[in-house]
């Protein structure tokens, strides 16, 4: 999640440091994630927490006993797209139903909020220059948000804003391979607010994922799963109302 990069690096080789759809104003670059005491505790929601972290309750998002990855995913084929009209993301010039899903539901069904947890299929895997955009609103008194870029049972990139971890707000990123969470990377810059709308953009780069929130760069996460084409699903979960999830190439 190191942030040692320049605008030139942001889209190396593209000749365009500010590609369409990616934030032009990068905001204050957050400090590198660093080690953070206790950061070695594996995992964002492997169903358990460090001792004392969540006294008397399961950690947010533990989903005890849940079958599969994202119980309650919407019925197959139901993929309403991003809102239309002013303020819809991404900006004009990109596909109107960016990424995957038409602006109305399938076969003329009206678009509406997406059911969370939600799976966004990525049929061709991920590839450099793919921009994934997620729009929603954080619920009041939220505990957590999670994005999981999945490769089968593995989680290639877990992006997990936690609103109250030991009375702190922190973003935890990690990878799960063969059911084992790796080394956490933590970010103390926290751009989410309970009850407020958000836009998360994830730009896939050859060596890392780049994340921006509300048009300001937030963090980078180096690829630990190298076969990007195997990352073929994005799971979205947590305490949010989800408006749209889509992707485009930039």
């Amino acid at each position: 999640m190191a942030d040692n990069f320049s605008l030139h690096d942001a889209l190396s080789g593209s000749g365009n440091p500010n590609p369409q759809g990616w934030p032009g104003a990068w905001g204050n670059q957050p400090a590198g994630a660093g080690g953070y005491p206790g950061a070695s505790y594996p995992g964002a929601y492997p169903g358990q927490a460090p001792p004392g972290a969540y006294p008397g309750q399961a950690p947010p998002g533990a989903y005890p006993g849940a079958p599969g990855a994202y119980p309650g995913a919407p019925a197959p084929g139901v993929y309403p797209g991003p809102p239309s009209g002013p303020g819809a993301y991404p900006s004009s010039g990109q596909p109107s139903a960016t990424g995957a899903y038409p602006a109305t539901g399938p076969y003329g069904a009206p678009a509406g909020p997406l059911i969370v947890p939600y799976n966004l299929p990525l049929p061709g895997g991920v590839v450099p220059r793919m921009l994934i955009t997620i729009l929603g609103t954080v619920k009041p008194n939220a505990n957590r948000i999670a994005l999981d870029f999945q490769r089968g049972n593995d989680v290639a990139f877990h992006f997990n804003p936690r609103f109250n971890e030991n009375n702190r707000r922190v973003i935890v990123c990690n990878t799960k391979l063969d059911n084992n969470w790796g080394r956490e990377e933590r970010q103390s810059v926290f751009p989410f607010e309970s009850g407020k709308p958000f836009k998360i953009q994830v730009l896939v780069e050859p060596d890392h994922f780049k994340v921006a929130v509300n048009d300001a760069h937030l963090l980078q996460y180096n690829h630990r799963v190298k076969k990007l084409n195997e990352i073929s699903k994005l799971g979205i979960s947590g305490d949010i109302d989800l408006t749209s999830a889509s992707y485009t190439m930039i």
């Epitope: 599969g68 990855a69 994202y70 995913a73 197959p76 084929g77 993929y79 990109q94 596909p95 109107s96 139903a97 960016t98 990424g99 995957a100 899903y101 038409p102 799976n119 299929p121 990525l122 049929p123 061709g124 895997g125 590839v127 999945q150 490769r151 089968g152 049972n153 593995d154 076969k227 084409n229 195997e230 073929s232 699903k233 992707y247 485009t248 190439m249």
Partner: antibody, heavy 115, light 107 residues
């Protein structure tokens, strides 16, 4: 090397059901979606649906949602497609293929529905 | 559903010719397009994905290009073994959809 093995042919009667198989080898089965594609003689390719072997999440072409049921058996790295209420319109070659762009295909099963 | 239109059902060519097969999507598919070659009695074979990425082992006379709604498969110098059916496909969203195919034949 990556292989998707399908039986060569199935002959069934109208109104019956059939379960076609696709056995994967040479890669981690749960890391790639399996897709099923229909091809009628002298006609094009038609996507039926796909399944994620890791958690059995499925997506169907609306046209086939009452016709096809996709399942997997992770222990044998095999994907299945059951076709029900068969008619002559279901006579076709059925391919399984890997991923969203199909880098590997099975050889196809020729299904004949005939009395 | 996204409709993929291959306007030419047949294209006549000679060995050594340069030929371009086109495909038009009914909406922007953001370069999520693949091309396949199919010969009689065989499964389709992947040539190109993400519009321009050549699959492993595909000869470099095959190139893919395009963006938005318009995509092209070009064979720079047609060989006898290239005479086949060619399909485009969008892998942008489900339902995944194919073009009707273009048959490349000898003049």
């Amino acid at each position: 090397q990556v292989q998707l093995q399908q039986p060569g042919a199935e002959l069934v009667g109208p109104g019956s059901s059939v379960k076609l198989s696709c056995k994967a080898s040479g890669y981690t089965f749960t890391n790639y979606w399996i897709h099923w594609v229909k091809q009628r003689p002298l006609q094009g390719l038609e996507w039926i649906g796909n399944i994620d072997p890791s958690d059995s999440e499925t997506h169907y072409n609306q046209k086939f949602k009452d016709k096809a049921t996709l399942t997997v058996d992770k222990s044998s790295s095999t994907a299945y497609m059951q076709l029900s209420s068969l008619t002559s319109e279901d006579s076709a070659v059925y391919y399984c293929a890997r991923h969203g762009y199909y880098d590997y295909w099975g050889q196809g099963t020729t299904l004949t529905v005939s009395s | 559903d996204i409709v993929m239109t291959q306007s030419h059902k047949f294209m006549s060519t000679s060995v050594g010719d340069r030929v371009s097969i086109t495909c038009k999507a009914s909406q922007d598919v953001s370069t999520a397009v693949a091309w396949y070659q199919q010969k009689p009695g065989q499964s389709p074979k992947l040539l190109i994905y993400w519009a321009s990425t050549r699959h492993t082992g595909v000869p470099d006379r095959f190139t893919g290009s395009g963006s938005g709604t318009d995509y092209t498969l070009t064979i720079s110098s047609v060989q006898a073994e290239d005479l086949a059916l060619y399909y485009c496909q969008q892998h942008y969203t489900t339902p995944l959809t194919f073009g009707a195919g273009t048959k490349l034949e000898l003049k």
